[in-house]
């Protein structure tokens, strides 16, 4: 948690924030972890500390290593670690995985791509944006503040996007680039009449008296986020909460589990210490949404414990 990976390219600016955050009034000391040598705060140095920030202006491959920051309040000292790796510039266009920031997803309605780490830098608009190393041109692309907006997003817009900007420090300019992948997701959702995947209709579930038993009610309702969808259990047509048997409880399983893009819900019925009278009850798995309600009924039957001695008679 308090060790953070940071990376950059040689001859570009890199600014790293101490992963251990403190109040603005707290002092922060930076050290090279390997030597415990203090990092200077004087801005004339190529690598210097400035409060919560460690600045490489510009970075060199030899700067790679672990840096320690100690945040000091009047009564507490707390430590963080920045694991910095500086890479040589690639001669070809491909951006290797180790230089990529987190992937972002977009859709027709939301197609913002934020420039990673830009908030750490002193930069001025506009940002330059590239896709797969080609400068972006055309009215569909708009560089706005620290992000790129793509109008009328299509699946072909997926790819690696690089932002390039200039960091200014005391009148000197340093280049910074950052790349992240952009994926396009289809937001075409729909809603169906509920489909119960489990249990099967009129299923007989074998249980052992005195043991615990679980019944899972699982149903799918369509694709994408569902406005109204629920699964629940009933006992003899009565809600579990109203039935009044503390041994029998229901709890949500995986919520909105999008397997194959489908929006599904699970509800697990837990029966503790199964009793004879539980075999007489009717267990209904109910799935409902705006289209209507579907019910699958389960009954319990006694499972005779295997008499291991008799096997070898």
């Amino acid at each position: 948690k308090f060790s953070k990976q940071s990376w950059g390219l040689e001859n570009e600016a890199l600014i790293v924030r101490c992963p251990r955050q403190g109040k603005p009034s707290y002092t922060v000391d930076w050290y090279y972890s390997q030597t415990n040598k203090s990092i200077p705060t004087q801005e004339r140095n190529r690598v210097f500390a400035s409060g919560q920030l460690l600045k490489f202006l510009p970075a060199a491959v030899a700067d790679s290593g672990i840096y320690t920051c100690i945040v000091r309040s009047p009564t507490f000292n707390r430590t963080g670690y920045a694991n910095v790796t500086i890479y040589k510039k690639q001669s070809d266009c491909n951006v290797p995985d180790y230089l990529m920031y987190s992937t972002v997803s977009g859709s027709e309605k939301n197609s913002k791509i934020y420039c990673p780490t830009i908030d750490l830098y002193n930069w001025t608009a506009p940002l330059e944006w590239f896709k797969n190393c080609q400068a972006l041109q055309g009215s569909r692309y708009r560089a706005h503040k620290s992000f790129l907006v793509i109008d009328n997003v299509m699946t072909e817009d997926a790819g690696d996007y690089t932002c390039k900007f200039i960091h200014n420090e005391n009148g000197a300019n340093y280049s910074v680039t950052a790349t992240r992948s952009f994926t396009v997701k289809d937001e075409q959702g729909f809603s169906l009449f509920p489909v119960i995947g489990a249990p099967a209709q009129n299923e007989i579930k074998e249980v052992e008296i005195g043991k615990n038993a679980n019944l899972t009610c699982s149903a799918c309702f369509g694709k994408g986020t569902q406005f109204l969808a629920a699964v629940l259990w009933q006992l003899n047509g009565t809600k579990i909460t109203d039935f009044g048997e503390p041994r029998i409880q229901q709890e949500e399983g995986q919520n909105q589990s999008f397997s194959n893009g489908l929006a599904c819900l699970d509800m697990v019925l837990r029966i503790a210490d199964v009793k004879e009278e539980d075999l007489l009850l009717q267990y209904d798995c109910l799935a409902l949404n705006l289209h209507g309600l579907r019910r699958h009924t389960v009954r319990l039957s006694r499972k005779n414990p295997i008499d291991h001695h008799s096997i070898y008679c």
Epitope: K1, F2, K23, T75, F76
Partner: antibody, heavy 123, light 107 residues
């Protein structure tokens, strides 16, 4: 010297209400996160609620959510806990405490505690 | 919610002996763990923060260690004033939670 002084405890019937206060002194109250922690007789410590510093965001334990409200008056250096719909299981010594570090969305230790005020919920 | 389990529930030792208290978390809390001491009729007192750092004014005989899910508070040589209840607390996220406590009593 940092000091926290709770008041407002007492005997209350189930379903009743009580308002606890915690007067703070010796530090810049407004910038610190403040916390209520309770301890039932003979039992361990249970976090009740946190209110962040200037931002004022609030957090509650599930056991008190919807019934208790934490608030602060930075001009009076005072922390409050409004307790409604009290239950027997709310009987405890209530401590107010200071989180000396927290930044937005994070939590830390409690470095100063009050002496506590006893709340008894009984008919 | 992260559950902290302290062991043993009670530790019976003599002054001068070494006390080793354990705190286990139900999931990783990194080093976001503190130890407190509480004496009867008093509020808890912070001993250790960030798993291993002693709070201001805490004697060097108290030390903390561990990371992730397993943590230890060690009192190298018990003084008469150290007999009390000790609690661990995690603060990696809300809700912050405490262990149920370990009582260190005089044998």
């Amino acid at each position: 010297e940092v000091q926290l002084l709770e008041s407002g405890g007492g005997l209350v019937q189930p379903g009743g209400s009580l308002r606890l206060s915690c007067a703070a002194s010796g530090f810049t109250f407004s910038i610190y996160d403040m916390i209520w922690v309770r301890q039932a007789p003979g039992k361990g410590l249970e976090w009740v609620s946190t209110i962040k510093g200037e931002g004022g965001g609030t957090y509650y334990a599930d056991s008190v959510k919807g019934r208790f409200t934490i608030s602060r008056d930075n001009s009076k250096n005072t922390l409050y806990l409004q307790m409604n719909s009290l239950r027997a299981e709310d009987t405890a010594v209530y401590y107010c405490a200071r989180d000396p570090w927290s930044t937005e969305g994070s939590f830390f230790v409690l470095d100063y505690w009050g002496q506590g005020t006893l709340v008894t919920v009984s008919s | 919610e992260i559950v902290l389990t302290q062991s043993p529930a009670t530790l019976s030792l003599s002054p001068g002996e070494r006390a080793t208290l354990s705190c286990r978390a139900s999931q990783s809390v990194d080093d976001d763990l503190a130890w407190y001491q509480q004496k009867p009729g008093q509020a808890p007192r912070l001993l250790i923060y960030d798993a291993s750092n002693r709070a201001t004014g805490i004697p060097a005989r108290f030390s903390g260690s561990g990371s992730g899910t397993d943590f230890t508070l060690t009192i190298s040589s018990l003084e008469p004033e150290d007999f009390a209840v000790y609690y661990c607390q995690q603060y990696i996220g809300a809700p912050i939670t405490f262990g149920q406590g370990t009582k260190v009593e005089i044998k």
